[in-house]
Amino acid sequence: KNLKSPQKVEVDIIDDNFILRWNRSDESVGNVTFSFDYQKTGMDNWIKLSGCQNITSTKCNFSSLKLNVYEEIKLRIRAEKENTSSWYEVDSFTPFRKAQIGPPEVHLEAEDKAIVIHISPGTKDSVMWALDGLSFTYSLVIWKNSSGVEERIENIYSRHKIYKLSPETTYCLKVKAALLTSWKIGVYSPVHCIKTTVENELPPPENIEVSVQNQNYVLKWDYTYANMTFQVQWLHAFLKRNPGNHLYKWKQIPDCENVKTTQCVFPQNVFQKGIYLLRVQASDGNNTSFWSEEIKFDTEIQAFLLPPVFNIRSLSDSFHIYIGAPKQSGNTPVIQDYPLIYEIIFWENTSNAERKIIEKKTDVTVPNLKPLTVYCVKARAHTMDEKLNKSSVFSDAVCEKTKPGNTSK
């Protein structure tokens, strides 16, 4: 009886794993084996596909074959018993185009209100993604084990920290990789769960802000308790992208080591141009807090995004605010040749209830004020460009009294 050639050959490539699957054409014929040949582009001869010769099942693995993943390849299969079937040719394909990104490896570390996620490519030193290692981004889905309500986080790198979690709570997450340059989305990792710890005695510092004063950077933060010492560390932001490397060499800022105030001042020349992460830790001598949230610090933007300077003209029921260019040392205005949005916060001096106005214009009216009442105003600038999504610190608050009720404009 003539053997029929196998049909429906599927090529599955996940990372560096090359798997072939096919259907038997004739289930009634026993003891049939299958063999593959391959042919590279521009070659006439067919070569035996190692790992896929005389296979008794309907699946084989040819991962050991060292292929150029960007080069087109053709496969053919036949059935063998005493005689052989005709060859069945599989549509040619380019491994890189066909490849899927496998599930990444995930390593979790827990704090009381945060989880650190370390992500590595599923295949170490992958040949398939050798040129794309630094281009991987990841996305994750996280949920409280008790509730199942999912939160998605997109565009993260090989180290990511999730904050504002609840202590003593189990969180579960799964991660997938993407190569946006090649329009490839990977498959999810298995689900990983971790329980946050009991609440730490000392909370981490909060609300870290960097501003520029003269030739110095001023780093400020808030802290709950007095009589503490603080230390500040920095890391090049690009190091979070480094696949497979999970040794992060955070560095001390010398002028911010064991400081006893909730701010520190250090020269601008501590940092070369670049994007950095900054974090702060508190200690009372016996106990240490976990590290604060890491803030992104871009020297280029920081250097030129200063808080706005403004004048207030007071009326009975409103303020007119005129925003000018910020002043550098020496009272020279800073020229800012990129569009800004201004955020103006105002409040009655005797109250904590703040109101906010967002304006593109440099002359702003603050309406609906009470006569003969002291209001305070502070402002900050935001870049409008999404790529330079940056905010200045707030200006110092300026307080003014509104005019009596009969003031006309």
Epitope: H107, E111, H246, F290
Partner: antibody, heavy 118, light 107 residues
Framework: EVRLQQSGAELVQPGASVKLSCTGF????????MHWVKQRTEQGLEWIGR????????KYAPKFQGQATITADTSSNTAYVQVSSLSSEDTAVYYC???????????WGQGTSVTVSS | DIVMTQSQKFMSTSVGDRVSVTCKAS??????VVWYQQKPGQSPKVLIY???YRYSGVPDRFTGSGSGTDFTLIISNVQSEDLAEYFC?????????FGGGTKLEIK
């Protein structure tokens, strides 16, 4: 194959100094931290400190601050610890260890025995 | 400094048994704990890192658990080659500190 090779045993006088070496094979010490750990006979492990060979930044346990000095020479892929003002309390085995991913001391040298005796 | 306390200096067990080695930190260290095994006359070797991750090549009879201040190393189906001293270490903040060690004796 990753390996840490430490210098040979030392017999030193009280009050003197000793400098121990640890050479890395199969990896570049610049990409890691290099730690030093002390272990006295039938005692636990004590962390002395570590260096980042890339920029020579060091951290020390308060107990060893001033007594131990950790250095590194990236050209020879070697880390060193110098311990000064030695006393009988410093008779111990000194280990170097590589600080790798997740800050784990993942590879250890074979240890150097230091005996302080007159 | 963070003090790591291993309350049991010695533990005696038999081949095939299950044994738990405990370690307590003087303050919350998250999951930043490593367990080492040191056999007589040898250097320490990593068993478990980040409280629960088994280091590559370590047999799966070694399991780590815990977070915050309380950590446990479990050796199930103890083998004669597990005769060693076991140390915990915190890597949460400098100075790194080790527990005093627990010696496992095989009956």
């Amino acid at each position: 194959e990753v390996r840490l090779q430490q210098s040979g045993a030392e017999l030193v006088q009280p009050g003197a100094s000793v400098k121990l070496s640890c050479t890395g094979f199969g990896f570049n010490i610049k990409d890691y931290y290099m730690h030093w750990v002390k272990q006295r006979t039938e005692q636990g492990l004590e962390w002395i400190g570590r260096i980042d060979p890339e920029d020579a930044e060091t951290k020390y346990a308060p107990k060893f601050q001033g007594q131990a000095t950790i250095t590194a020479d990236t050209s020879s892929n070697t880390a060193y610890v110098q311990v000064s003002s030695l006393s009988s309390e410093d008779t111990a085995v000194y280990y170097c260890a590589r600080g790798g991913n997740f800050y784990v001391m993942d590879y250890w040298g074979q240890g150097t025995s230091v005996t302080v005796s007159s | 400094d963070i003090v790591m306390t291993q309350s049991q200096k010695f533990m005696s067990t038999s081949v095939g048994d299950r044994v738990s080695v405990t370690c307590k930190a003087s303050q919350n260290v998250g999951t930043n704990v490593v367990w080492y095994q040191q056999k007589p006359g040898q250097s320490p070797k990593v068993l478990i890192y980040s409280a629960s991750y088994r280091y590559s090549g370590v047999p799966d009879r070694f399991t780590g658990s815990g977070s915050g201040t309380d950590f446990t190393l479990i050796i199930s189906n103890v083998q004669s080659e597990d005769l060693a001293e076991y140390f915990c270490q915190q890597k949460n903040s400098y100075p790194y500190t080790f527990g005093g060690g627990t010696k496992l004796e095989i009956k």
